[in-house]
């Protein structure tokens, strides 16, 4: 699996999950989240050659097409597969509120 | 929706489904499919700016991050959303066989 266990400990050039820390204030301009100040969101990056963690029948065909037509702009793309939630604290008036923001952290990637 | 109805009739620069015809023999090197000779597979292409058909909470965050950090390599990617099957005919010996290959045709795209 192209997950954090494999990708963070290798020098993989193909589609893999990469480290990315997002500071809510600096990177998003968000002041409304009290805690945490930022989080390890991660992101997916890298080419998707033939048979590399391909998502569907279509992505197999497209990877094969791309292999035979390397100049073509049609190619599978490396995108999130498994996502995890992030618990946050924000204020409503003076009252702190805890909420889970779903699908916020990338744990693994796929070629789609 | 970023589907064939909208995308094929517009000059949309952002993420949209684009026309792509794949000739099985010329593009994939396949002789084993008897019918059809090729098909309109289509593909997804175009940038994914903030709020453009974003798939998850994470892709919204990443698009916003990208807006604030335009040089960053972390950005959502335009990938297939709705896929349709393709019926094919091939031969096993002298016997024709009809099969539906699932998820072969892109009907719409999303930013993931």
């Amino acid at each position: 699996a192209l997950d954090t266990n494999y990708c963070f400990s290798s020098t993989e050039k193909n589609c893999c999950v990469r480290q990315l820390y997002i500071d809510f204030r600096k990177d998003l301009g968000w002041k409304w989240i009290h805690e945490p100040k930022g989080y390890h969101a991660n992101f997916c990056l890298g080419p998707c050659p033939y048979i590399w963690s391909l998502d569907t029948q279509y992505s197999k065909v497209l990877a094969l097409y791309n292999q035979h037509n390397p100049g073509a702009s049609a190619a599978p793309c490396c995108v999130p597969q498994a996502l995890e939630p992030l618990p946050i604290v924000y204020y409503v008036g003076r009252k702190p509120k805890v909420e889970q923001l779903s699908n916020m952290i990338v744990r693994s990637c796929k070629c789609s | 929706a970023l589907d064939t109805n909208y995308c094929f009739s517009s000059t949309e620069k952002n993420c949209c489904v684009r026309q792509l015809y794949i000739d099985f023999r010329k593009d994939l090197g396949w002789k084993w499919i008897h019918e059809p000779k090729g098909y309109h597979a289509n593909f997804c292409l175009g940038p994914c700016p903030y709020i453009w058909s974003l798939d998850t909470q994470y892709s919204k965050v990443l698009a916003l991050y990208n807006q604030h950090n335009p040089g960053a390599s972390a950005a959502p990617c335009c990938v297939p959303q709705a896929l349709e099957p393709l019926p094919i005919v091939y031969y096993v010996g002298r016997k024709p066989k009809v099969e539906q290959l699932s998820n072969m045709i892109v009907r719409s795209c999303k930013c993931s």
Partner: nanobody
Framework: QLQLVESGGGLVQPGGSLRLSCTAS???????????MAWFRQTPGKQRELVAL??????NYADSVKGRFTISRDNAKNTVYLQMNMLQPEDTAVYVC????????????WGQGTQVTVSS
């Protein structure tokens, strides 16, 4: 039972040659069409890298092996070959074959791999 058996690996000196073969056995390979056959290689701590790929009438090679390696197939024997010439130490790896079969969709099967070591 589906099986891919590779052979032909071994120890060879730089500049030498080897011919790998991968034979697909099992009823699936006789009944269903093969849509692609490929050779990949794997070095310790790295994922598999595509070396060569063949479909019915097209072949494709990694830049690092172009002009030195040749992929071919014998449909009657359900076998794919990899002729490797002018081998270099950086070609040292486990070579694994992959066969794509049309069986309720595009299915892929992996072999166990054969070790190729290029050293003087």
């Amino acid at each position: 039972q589906l099986q891919l058996v590779e052979s032909g690996g071994g120890l060879v000196q730089p500049g030498g040659s080897l011919r790998l073969s991968c034979t697909a056995s099992g009823s699936t390979f006789e009944i269903y069409p093969i849509y692609a056959m490929a050779w990949f290689r794997q070095t310790p701590g790295k994922q598999r890298e595509l070396v060569a790929l063949t479909t019915d009438v097209k072949t494709n090679y990694a830049d690092s092996v172009k002009g030195r390696f040749t992929i071919s197939r014998d449909n009657a024997k359900n076998t794919v070959y990899l002729q490797m010439n002018m081998l270099q130490p950086e070609d040292t790896a486990v070579y694994v074959c992959n066969v794509g079969v049309v069986r309720g969709g595009l299915q892929n099967y992996w072999g166990q791999g054969t070790q190729v070591t290029v050293s003087s």
